[in-house]
């Protein structure tokens, strides 16, 4: 499999058959698949060097792995997008052997003197062809030469089979399955041959191709493949339940932010709640996690403005649940990214010198910002797309807080909507879905560059649109939701999570 290890070295060779038998639409589809693969790999913070070859009678090398920009995913994607099927129109035979020889030439080194680290570089060949080679001879011989060059299968104690993966995608109206199978790697419990039909569900294909065991701790990563559970798609999501004898129970959401901490809303708890009465579950697991302590933001005080006629005051409505035992990360339990951390800098593919302010400008620009939250409906986790009103609609969004029960007498809305809040909901630019009571404490998320970054914690809403946990279809335009802006509580997060190796900026 493609081992996505951010500290490893990898060359990926994209080889695309542009011969007559492929056809223009299949060629375009194959290109799209490769663009998606480049993006998927880049989302892991991995920077492989790419080689890009198209071929028919002759190969054409568009990108060499030795080029400075070959590890720049955006640049490689641009080169790929500029390739036309017509480029091989005049000489449209199928010489797969010559194309693979072009790959061999990129792998090999001058004067037989291997560069430092050659033996730690993994090589992945992704060949898109119909397998109908009609000139140049059998391409399998070049695969053998490549194996020889990389010293694969020659040392009994160190076969190095994981240093070469050959994936073959059958494209075109007619595919020679025998030829395709012969070229692809054969490894136990792995799939290296894919058909056109598979390309309709690329996430499923990538799930078969990628080994992410070295990057399970990466924040904000998800799998969207069809066989995936809700928690493959939202691996950070935590369900919180507080049992109060004779008072029933309170349900909230939270987000895994590190191996020991879940971030949620402070209002989910009271000062009387004992740790043993708080149930937290992650990854869709039945068992509850043991809790060591709940840490409230020191400035949170729900009764802080009672004298001023404000029954409930949600400023600084954030809490961290510290777990007794370390979480074991896997595909259904992973952290979400937090603002102003090194992990988020990498997730957004920003330079290492990026400041907290620059992250804020990237994630929360002064405009309507597409975001999402996760809600549970009929025992299923679903993503709800909303817009954070952070531009010209911000004022009107915040003013609608006056329609919240108990806030109708508030003279100055900034008394309840402090600078700590982000506002969503309403009907412009689109009709936003609203949060339900049970969504409180869950993350408000910005999805960028295939990664998920938490920018807020769901706190309170103007209108209860969820009678009996069923969302009403028709809701008033003033149905707004308010979320604690994580950029505004960073000193507290940084202090409480200082031992979690998140690399706060």
């Amino acid at each position: 499999k493609i081992v996505l290890d951010p500290s490893g070295s990898m060359n990926i060779y994209l080889v695309l058959d542009g011969s007559d038998s492929i056809g223009a639409s299949n060629f375009t589809g194959a290109k799209k698949c490769l663009v998606n693969l480049i993006e998927k790999v880049a989302s892991y913070g991995v920077k492989p060097r790419y080689g890009l070859v198209t071929y028919a009678t002759y190969p054409k090398i568009w990108v060499k792995v030795s080029e400075a920009d070959s590890s720049n995913a955006d640049w490689v994607t641009k080169q790929l997008n500029e390739i036309n099927y017509e480029d091989h129109k005049l000489k449209s035979g199928t010489n797969t052997k010559k194309a693979l020889q072009a790959v061999y030439s990129m792998m090999s080194w001058p004067d037989d003197v291997p560069p430092e680290g050659w033996n730690r570089t993994r090589h992945v060949i992704i060949l898109m062809t119909d397998g109908l080679h009609n000139m140049g001879g059998d391409p399998i011989t070049v695969i053998d030469e490549i194996r020889d060059l990389l010293y694969i299968g020659k040392d009994r104690k160190n076969p190095r089979e994981d240093y070469l993966d050959v994936y073959v995608f059958g494209v075109g109206p007619l595919v020679n399955q025998v030829n395709i199978n012969a070229l692809a790697s054969k490894k136990d419990n792995e799939q290296h041959v894919f058909k056109v039909k598979d390309m309709e569900n690329l996430e499923d294909v990538f799930y078969q191709m990628i080994d992410e065991s070295q990057s399970l701790s990466l924040c904000g990563m998800v799998w969207e493949h069809r066989k995936g559970t809700d928690y493959h798609k939202q691996p950070w999501q935590a369900k919180i339940s507080v049992i109060r004898p004779s008072k029933g129970h309170e349900s909230c959401m939270g987000a895994v932010v590190s191996e020991y901490f879940v971030l949620t809303a402070a209002h989910c708890f009271t000062v009387d709640d004992k740790e043993h009465s708080i149930k937290v579950s992650v990854g869709g697991e039945k068992r509850d996690l043991e809790i060591e302590v709940v840490l409230f933001h020191p400035n949170y005080n729900i009764n802080g403005k009672k004298e001023a006629g404000i029954p409930e005051f949600y400023d600084y409505d954030v809490a961290l649940i510290k777990l007794k035992n370390k979480l074991k990360y896997g595909q259904t339990i992973r952290p979400i990214c937090l603002p102003c951390t090194e992990g988020t800098t990498r997730a957004l593919r920003l330079p290492p010198t990026t400041t907290c302010q620059q992250q804020k400008e990237e994630l929360l620009p002064a405009q309507d910002i597409k975001a999402l939250f996760v809600s549970e409906e009929e025992k299923k986790l679903t993503r709800k797309e909303v817009y954070i009103k952070n531009g010209d609609k911000k004022g009107s969004c915040e003013r609608d807080a006056q329609y919240a029960p108990g806030y109708d007498k508030v003279k100055d809305i900034s008394e309840v909507v402090t600078p700590r809040f982000l506002c969503t909901g309403g009907v412009s630019p689109y009709a936003d879905p609203n949060t339900c009571r049970g969504d409180s404490g869950g993350p408000l998320i910005v999805h960028k560059r295939s990664r998920f970054i938490q920018v807020g914690v769901i706190s309170w809403g103007v209108v209860d649109v969820c009678k009996n946990q069923k969302r009403q279809k028709q809701v008033p335009a003033h149905a707004r939701d308010f979320h604690i802006n994580l950029f505004q509580v960073l000193p507290w997060l940084k202090e409480k999570l200082q031992d979690e190796d998140l690399g706060f900026l």
Epitope: P114, D155, R156, K157
Partner: antibody, heavy 121, light 111 residues
């Protein structure tokens, strides 16, 4: 056809130095471990050391009895293995064989004819 | 280091008889499902010759009367029916752990 030919043996005084060579042909030299094995007169075989193949950067390993005194090196452009022997002792007297160590099964499948080193005053 | 002990030191047999040579290792020479034990034959004035590799695999060009068996620490070289040219010294050698080591040898002589 695989061939290994040792040279450089001879008579040397205790404390002296000698360099043995092993010229090879018929196989891809850099892809193999290459070992030196010695045999004292009337005694059994004793492994001296080896140079690993290219994946391991041709790093070396030695028997305790020669460590610090003997150095194995190779010139891949000449397909030749060397054994530099310093601070020689009388107990180093032996026939020195060079052998190809096949990483496909970690056994010495081809041997040279050997070269005699005599350490005596 | 792994010490290899061969027995017997000398074995006197007649042509046509079956020879069984033993080699015991001070610790296991197995790794990842393979036993890294090899057997060599050496005749006077000649270089050693590989007979068996990885405990039981016959090197190409070696007659089928030679066979190897064993795993872990106990290994056996068997010659099913001795031919006159089989009388020589036999060495076992482990290549599982550095440094490589040889047994002291078993001399197979004509009775």
């Amino acid at each position: 056809e695989v061939q290994l030919v040792e040279s450089g043996g001879g008579l040397v005084q205790p404390g002296g130095s000698l360099r043995l060579s092993c010229a090879t042909s018929g196989f891809t030299f850099r892809d193999y471990y290459m070992s030196w094995v010695r045999q004292a007169p009337g005694k059994g075989l004793e492994w001296v050391g080896f140079s690993r193949h290219r994946v391991y950067g041709y790093t070396t390993e030695y028997a305790a009895s020669v460590k610090g005194r003997f150095t194995i090196s190779r010139d891949n452009s000449k397909n030749t293995l060397y054994l530099q022997m310093n601070s020689l002792k009388t107990e180093d007297t032996a026939v020195y064989y060079c052998a190809r160590d096949n990483p496909g099964y970690y056994a010495m499948d081809y041997w040279g004819q050997g070269t005699l080193v005599t350490v005596s005053s | 280091e792994i010490v290899l002990t061969q027995s017997p030191a000398t074995l006197s047999l007649s042509p046509g008889e079956r020879a069984t040579l033993s080699c015991k290792a001070s610790q296991s020479v197995d790794y990842d499902g393979d036993s890294y034990m090899n057997w060599y034959q050496q005749k006077p004035g000649q270089a050693p010759r590989l007979l068996i590799y990885a405990a039981s695999n016959l090197e190409s060009g070696i007659p089928a009367r030679f066979s190897g068996s064993g795993s872990g620490t106990d290994f056996t070289l068997t010659i099913s029916s001795l031919e006159p040219e089989d009388f020589a010294v036999y060495y076992c050698q482990q290549s599982n752990a550095d440094p490589y080591t040889f047994g002291q040898g078993t001399k197979l002589e004509i009775k």
